[in-house]
Interface confidence: low
Amino acid sequence: QRLSRAQQQLPLESLGWDIAELQLNHTGPQQDPRLYWQGGPALGRSFLRGPELDKGQLRIRRDGIYMVHIQVTLAICSSTSTSRHHHPTTLAVGICSPASRSISLLRLSFHQGCTIASQRLTPLARGDTLCTNLTGTLLPSRNTDETFFGVQWVRP
Amino acid sequence: QRLSRAQQQLPLESLGWDIAELQLNHTGPQQDPRLYWQGGPALGRSFLRGPELDKGQLRIRRDGIYMVHIQVTLAICSSTSTSRHHHPTTLAVGICSPASRSISLLRLSFHQGCTIASQRLTPLARGDTLCTNLTGTLLPSRNTDETFFGVQWVRP
Amino acid sequence: QRLSRAQQQLPLESLGWDIAELQLNHTGPQQDPRLYWQGGPALGRSFLRGPELDKGQLRIRRDGIYMVHIQVTLAICSSTSTSRHHHPTTLAVGICSPASRSISLLRLSFHQGCTIASQRLTPLARGDTLCTNLTGTLLPSRNTDETFFGVQWVRP
C-alpha cells in the first residue's frame, strides 16, 4: 500500500511526526495495575508533540503506524526478588480504550531480571489510549533513565 | 509544537536524517568505564552519516529528537558470572559533554543475563557527546551482531 | 553522506517508507532452525508495506538503512527451563540470501530469561532475505504480543 498522490506532496506537518517520550509519575491504587505517566520539558527530557495525556495514559491524536517502545526497571530489585514470586511480574502495553479496540500489543515478564525493554511497530488510530499494566507486587523505579515509555509516528 | 512553516517545505537534506550505527572498538583503560566505538563501511555494517566520533565517543552534529539504541553482550558470560558479583554490571548511556548538559539517558543492569538491549527517544543538541559507561569487572563482546550502539534523528 | 540533490525533492513515495511487522506462523522442521513469519491485516496487527514474505522469510524490496527489531518469548518457559540447558537457547537475525551477503545482524541468548528483545540499524539491499534462527530445544510463543519481528526503512 503506497502513499496516495495527495499525501505525497503535502508539507511535513500534515504527515504527522507525532512523538512522545514519557516518564513514570506514579503507580495506580491497589486494584489498578496501570502505570501513570507524565511528560513535558519542565520535568526533564520527556515531551509530548502530538499525542496527549489523559489521566496519565497516552492518547493518540493521529492515525498511522507507530513505533511503541518501553523500558521499565523494578525498584529495590535483585534477581532473587523477581524469581521468588510464584507469579512473575509482567508488563503489558495495550490499547485500553475505546473498549472496542482493546488489545494487548506488547507483553514481557521479568523472570530473573530487573529490567524489561522492548519495542514494536503497530497501527494506531486517533483516540486510541495506550495503557501499561504492571502486574505483581514489585514496584517500578521512577528514575527517568530506568523507566520510560514512548511512541513515534513513522508513516500513514 | 508543530514544524514552523519555514521548516515544512525544505528539502529532506535540511531536515537531518542524521544516523549512526557503531561497533565496539575497545574498552577504556583501568579507571575509564567508557566503551570506545568505531564505525565505517570498511569495518562491516557500521556507519556514520552526520554524527561523528571523537576519540571513540559519538558526537551529535544536528539538533533534534533522536532514537538512541544500544545492545551490549558480555563476553565469556554465563548467568552465574553475572549474578555472583555483589555489584551488578551496569551500562549507562548519557551525555558526557558539554558538562553543563551532562545527564544519564538510559541505564540497565545485567543481573542474571548476559545481554542488555534498549532504546529511547531523547532531545539532543549539536555538540552533545554521548558516552556509554560499563561498570563492573566483566568485559563486553566485540562481535558486531552482539554489541552495537546507534542513533537516528527522527524529527526537529 | 547526504542525500543527492535528485533525491531531496522527490515525492515521499519514492523515498521508501517500506515497513513490515510480522507475527510468528510456525517453526521449521527438525533440522531447520528458522522461524516462519506471517503478516497481514486479516491476521491481526501485522502488516507488510513494501517488503514481502518468501516461504515465511522476509525479503527486502528497497535499498536503504533499516531499523530491524524483534521480540521472541519462549513458550512454557521459566528461568529454570532456560538455565538448565547446557547450550543456551539463542536467537540470531541475519541475511540468509543471497549467499554472497550472508551475515548475522543481531544475536541474543536467553540465559535465565524467557524473552529477548532488541533492535538495530543496518543497511539492507533489494533482494536481501532476512532469517531468524532459533537454536535450542525450547519453542517460541505464538502470542502476537509476545513474539514479533519487523523492519522499518529509515533513510536511503
Epitope: - | L24, N25, H26, Q38, L43, L53 | S100
Partner: antibody
Framework: QVQLQESGPGLVKPSETLSLTCTVS??????????WSWIRQPPGKGLEWLGY???????NYNPSLKSRVTISVDTSKNQFSLKLRSVTTADTAVYYC??????????????WGQGTLVTVSS | EIVLTQSPATLSLSPGERATLSCRAS??????LAWYQQKPGQAPRLLIF???NRATGIPARFSGSGSGTDFTLTISSLEPEDFAVYYC?????????FGGGTKVEIK
Amino acid sequence: QVQLQESGPGLVKPSETLSLTCTVSGGSVSSDYYYWSWIRQPPGKGLEWLGYIYYSGSTNYNPSLKSRVTISVDTSKNQFSLKLRSVTTADTAVYYCARGDGDFMGVCFDYWGQGTLVTVSS
Amino acid sequence: EIVLTQSPATLSLSPGERATLSCRASQSVSSYLAWYQQKPGQAPRLLIFDASNRATGIPARFSGSGSGTDFTLTISSLEPEDFAVYYCQQRSNWPLTFGGGTKVEIK
C-alpha cells in the same frame, strides 16, 4: 588521498638500534579509525607484521619482536616511528609503514608507504 | 599464532585465463582475511578485505570467497598487469600474519 613516506638510515650496524619515521599526508594519525603499523619484508621473502600504534598511544607488537620493538606517535607532526633494538643481519629487510583499517582485534592495510630498505651490516 | 598456507607457490597462466589462488588457515579466522597484490619493487596493494569485499578501486575481475579456514582469490580473466605475487593476511587474531605468497607468472 592518504600518502605515507618512510624515512631513516639505510644502513645500521649489528647490535645498534634501527630507527624509522613515517610521515602521513592527506590524513591524520589522530583519526579514531586507523591503526598505524609497520611491516617488513626480507629480500625475496614474505611479509611480517611488526606492530601498530593507535592515536591514543596504545600499541600492539608481534610477540616474536616484542622485547626489541617500540612504536611511538607524534600527532603534532602527523608522524609515527619505529625503533628496533639490538639488530642483527636477520633484520635486513624492506620496512613499510601502513595504515591499518579494522579494529583493535585486527586490521588489514589499505595504504602503504613505498618502503625503505634497511641493511644491517658492519 | 595462526599460520596461513598459500597454494600453489607458483601459478603459470596466460592472459585471459582464470586464476584461482588458495589460502588455508591453521585455525578458523572467521571471515577476517585479506588479499594483497605485490609487484616487483612496489608495496603491496589491498585487493580484498574480510574475505569477499573488494577494496576501493579494485576491478570486478578480482573476487574473494571462503570463511573459517579455507579461502580463495579468483581473477576471472587475467590482464597483463595482474602478473604479480599475491599474499593473504588474517586479522582474526594477534599477531597479524601473512601467507607465504603465490606468484602468478606468464606462461
